[in-house]
């Protein structure tokens, strides 16, 4: 398994990840957003709701 060198993003990237943590993938020369639960997108800019349908009376 290849080792990936990571560190925190620089202050230059403040605000890059809207709803998540910014990680600097050193060997890949790029910033990566680790999104909070419920968010997706390159910059964690999209909110998605997982809707759980209640069980129908027939099923009960």
């Amino acid at each position: 398994v290849a080792q990936v060198s990571i560190t925190k993003c620089s202050s230059d990237m403040n605000g890059y990840c809207l709803h998540g943590q910014c990680i600097y993938l050193v060997d890949m020369s790029q910033n990566y957003c680790r999104c909070e639960v419920g968010y997706t997108g390159v910059r964690c800019e999209h909110f998605f709701l997982t809707v759980h349908q209640p069980l129908s009376k027939e099923y009960v």
């Epitope: 560190t7 620089s10 230059d12 990237m13 605000g15 890059y16 910033n31 390159v42 910059r43 800019e45």
Partner: antibody
Amino acid sequence: QDQLVQSGAEVKKPGASVKVSCKASGFNIKDTYIQWVRQAPGQGLEWMGRIDPLRGRTKYREKFEGRVTITADTSTNTAYMELSSLRSEDTAVYYCVRSGTLFDFWGQGTLVTVSS
Amino acid sequence: DIQMTQSPSSLSASVGDRVTITCKASQDIHKYIAWYQQKPGQAPRLLIQYTSTLQPGVPSRFSGSGSGTDYTFTISSLQPEDIATYYCLQYDNLRTFGGGTKVEIK
């Protein structure tokens, strides 16, 4: 293949304004920051400012504050840099640079000549 | 604004020589420094980022080191194709380039 294609060379008179465009292809500018850097003939590289196209937020180098405006049109995947009150010292090659999802990917540069 | 003082501004060395360029930041930049090579009429080419990480395709004779405010870029054995101007860039807090170092062959 990712590309940043800039508008063509411009010749402007002192006091005029110039607007340079930077069209991205192969990626979405909303995923990045777009920086602008210039280089006068025979001189070094100078960072001017940047935009976060997703939120429209800008940061400028102090010396350009009030004279430079960086904008982005996410519908056309294009960033712009407008410099006003041009003087001869603004004669330079202007580069747009993508950062964020990839460290510093440069456009080909746009030569702006300021001459009376 | 963070200032980057790059030295020397120019140097002349022989093929095979070890060449060293330094950049001093006006404050701690936490290793967020990159080094570029620029040849006349071309856009800058990224060689190294995050102090010492070589970009794909960049020869191993190029290296970088440092921490805090003091950083060094080294060409271990100068080649004719290395004739260019080299710039440091801090990207810890916004961005600032060093003044550049023009490398020539003796």
